[in-house]
C-alpha cells in the first residue's frame, strides 16, 4: 500500500499471553515480533484491537490448543472472532470448531480464521475461545492481527 | 494497491516440491499457478522468499501432511514460518501444531499460517516442518506466499 | 488501500448457505455480516465470486465440517478453491484435506485456505468439497472471500 500521510498503512499483529482471568476472551501483548503500525490501531486492555478509521480490514487469528476428548466437555473447542462496534451489540464474524483429540495427555491442533470486514471508527475486534486454559502460548502458536485494505 | 512504478505491487505464491534433501526446510517452485509479481521478491535456492524492500508484509503458508500416531514420535507435526534478516539470527514468526492421526495408514491434515510482519531489505522467510516426508505435494495442498501492504 | 475512483477497493466476503442442490460446489449468500465492496466483484448464482478487473487477488475460504470415519468413505474430506477463467478449463488453486474424525456422531474440524493469484477480467472462483452435507452453516463457520491487492 505504501500510502502517504493522508492514507497511512494500518496493520497490527499481536502475540498471545497467558492470563489468570477467568474469561473466554483471549489476552494479547505487544511482545516478541509484533506489529503495531501507528496509533490508528491500538491494543486495548490486552484483549481487543481497536481501529480509528472506517474501512475494509482483513482480520485474522490463529489459535493453537491442546485438549483431550475424555477430559473435555462433549462440545468441540471453538474459536470465535468477534466485533464490538460503538453503540452496537457484539457479533460473531468468524468461528472455527475442532473436536477434541483422543491423544493423551492432550492432542495439539491449530485453528486459523481470516476474512474481510467493514469496520467503523472505534470498532474493536477480539477472540473468544471455549476454554482458554487449553490454549498454547509457545512462540508463534497463537496470534491475532489485521490490516487495512 | 495498483501502485505506480515508485510503489509497485509485490506478491508471491509458490508451490511445494518433493525434495531429496534431508532438511526440515520445505522446498518450493515457480510452477503450476504460481505468482511472482516482479524482481522485488524472489525465490532463492527453492527454499526461501526474499524481499528487496522494507515494509509490512502479509506472509502465509499452507501445509497438508499425512501421518500416523503409532509410527510417529509423541511430538506433534509442527509447521513453522521463520524469518532470516541480514545480520540477525533466524526467528520463528508463526507455528502450528497438529497431533498425528490414528487413521491407517495415515491421516491427512492441513495447517494454515498467516500474519503481518515488518521485513527489512534482504530479509528471507521460509517454512520448516518436523517431518518433510509426511508433506503432501498434490496439486494445491501445500503452498507459501506473501504480499506487501 | 483507500484508492481513488480510478482504482477503487475491491473486496468480498460471503456467507455459506445450505443447499438442496446435489453438487459439490458450495453455495454462498450476501447475508449476515457480509462484504461486497462494489460491482467490480459479484456473487454469481450463489456459487462463485466473479471479478471484472485483472490483477492480483488474495483469495480465501474457510470451511467447517462435521464427519465420522465409520460413516464416511475412506477418502478424507477435501476442500478445493477453484478458478474458472473465460475460455479456459477449471483449475485447482488450493486444496486442504482432513481425515474424518472418530468422534460420534461426528467430529467438527475447520479448514482454512488462502493465497495470492492473478485473475483475468471475468474470472470466477468457487469452492468445492467432497461432501456438502457435512458442512457447518452456523454463524461464522463457513465463509469465502477475496481482496484485490
Amino acid at each position: 500500500m505504501q500510502k502517504g500521510d493522508q492514507n497511512p498503512q494500518i496493520a497490527a499483529h499481536v502475540i498471545s499471553e497467558a492470563s489468570s482471568k477467568t474469561t473466554s476472551v483471549l489476552q494479547w501483548a505487544e511482545k516478541g515480533y509484533y506489529t503495531m503500525s501507528n496509533n490508528l490501531v491500538t491494543l486495548e486492555n490486552g484483549k481487543q484491537l481497536t481501529v480509528k478509521r472506517q474501512g475494509l480490514y482483513y482480520i485474522y487469528a490463529q489459535v493453537t490448543f491442546c485438549s483431550n476428548r475424555e477430559a473435555s466437555s462433549q462440545a468441540p473447542f471453538i474459536a470465535s472472532l468477534c466485533l464490538k462496534s460503538p453503540g452496537r451489540f457484539e457479533r460473531i464474524l468468524l468461528r472455527a470448531a475442532n473436536t477434541h483429540s483422543s491423544a493423551k495427555p492432550c492432542g495439539q491442533q491449530s485453528i486459523h480464521l481470516g476474512g474481510v470486514f467493514e469496520l467503523q471508527p472505534g470498532a474493536s475486534v477480539f477472540v473468544n475461545v471455549t476454554d482458554p486454559s487449553q490454549v498454547s502460548h509457545g512462540t508463534g502458536f497463537t496470534s491475532f492481527g489485521l490490516l487495512k485494505l | 494497491m495498483q501502485k505506480g512504478d515508485q510503489n509497485p505491487q509485490i506478491a508471491a505464491h509458490v508451490i511445494s516440491e518433493a525434495s531429496s534433501k534431508t532438511t526440515s526446510v520445505l522446498q518450493w517452485a515457480e510452477k503450476g499457478y504460481y505468482t511472482m509479481s516482479n524482481n522485488l521478491v524472489t525465490l532463492e535456492n527453492g527454499k526461501q522468499l526474499t524481499v528487496k524492500r522494507q515494509g509490512l508484509y502479509y506472509i502465509y503458508a499452507q501445509v497438508t501432511f499425512c501421518s500416523n500416531r503409532e509410527a510417529s514420535s509423541q511430538a506433534p507435526f509442527i509447521a513453522s514460518l521463520c524469518l532470516k534478516s541480514p545480520g540477525r539470527f533466524e526467528r520463528i514468526l508463526l507455528r502450528a501444531a497438529n497431533t498425528h492421526s490414528s487413521a491407517k495408514p495415515c491421516g491427512q491434515q492441513s495447517i494454515h499460517l498467516g500474519g503481518v510482519f515488518e521485513l527489512q531489505p534482504g530479509a528471507s522467510v521460509f517454512v520448516n516442518v518436523t517431518d518433510p516426508s509426511q508433506v503432501s505435494h498434490g496439486t494445491g495442498f501445500t503452498s507459501f506466499g506473501l504480499l506487501k501492504l | 488501500m483507500q484508492k481513488g475512483d480510478q482504482n477503487p477497493q475491491i473486496a468480498a466476503h460471503v456467507i455459506s448457505e445450505a443447499s438442496s442442490k446435489t453438487t459439490s460446489v458450495l453455495q454462498w449468500a450476501e447475508k449476515g455480516y457480509y462484504t461486497m465492496s462494489n460491482n467490480l466483484v459479484t456473487l454469481e448464482n450463489g456459487k462463485q465470486l466473479t471479478v471484472k478487473r485483472q490483477g492480483l487477488y488474495y483469495i480465501y475460504a474457510q470451511v467447517t465440517f462435521c464427519s465420522n470415519r465409520e460413516a464416511s468413505s475412506q477418502a478424507p474430506f477435501i476442500a478445493s478453491l477453484c478458478l474458472k477463467s473465460p475460455g479456459r478449463f477449471e483449475r485447482i488453486l488450493l486444496r486442504a484435506a482432513n481425515t474424518h474424525s472418530s468422534a460420534k456422531p461426528c467430529g467438527q474440524q475447520s479448514i482454512h485456505l488462502g493465497g495470492v493469484f492473478e485473475l483475468q477480467p471475468g474470472a470466477s472462483v468457487f469452492v468445492n468439497v467432497t461432501d456438502p452435507s457435512q458442512v457447518s452453516h452456523g454463524t461464522g463457520f463457513t465463509s469465502f472471500g477475496l481482496l484485490k491487492l
Epitope: - | S20, C106, S133 | -
Partner: nanobody, 115 residues
Amino acid sequence: EVQLVESGGGLVQPGGSLRLSCAASGRIFSTYFMGWFRQAPGKEREWVSTIYSNGTPAYADSVKGRFTISADNSKNTAYLQMNSLKPEDTAVYYCAAWLNGGNRWGQGTLVTVSS
C-alpha cells in the same frame, strides 16, 4: 513418474503361505510408508498392513499374528509375508505407498485361498 509393481500373488490352499513384493521405481525423493490394502469381491477396499520409514509396522486386527511386513529401503521394496492363509483372505492385494508427498497405488495382484 513413480510406479509401484506388485508380484507374488497366486492360488494357495488354506493354511498355506505366500510372499508379496512391492517394488517402487522412478525418481524417489522421500518415502513415508509402504504397505498393502486389499479388496475382496463385492467389498470395499480395506487396509491390511503398513511399514513406516522409521521401521514401525502396523497391522489390521484381521491379519495380526499371521502376516509380517518388512522393507528393503535400499531397493525401495516392501514385502508382505502371509502365513496361515484363510479363504477370507482371498482378494486383490494393492500396494500403497506415500512417496514424494503423495499416495501411490499399484495395479494389484490376486491372492486366492481355496482348496
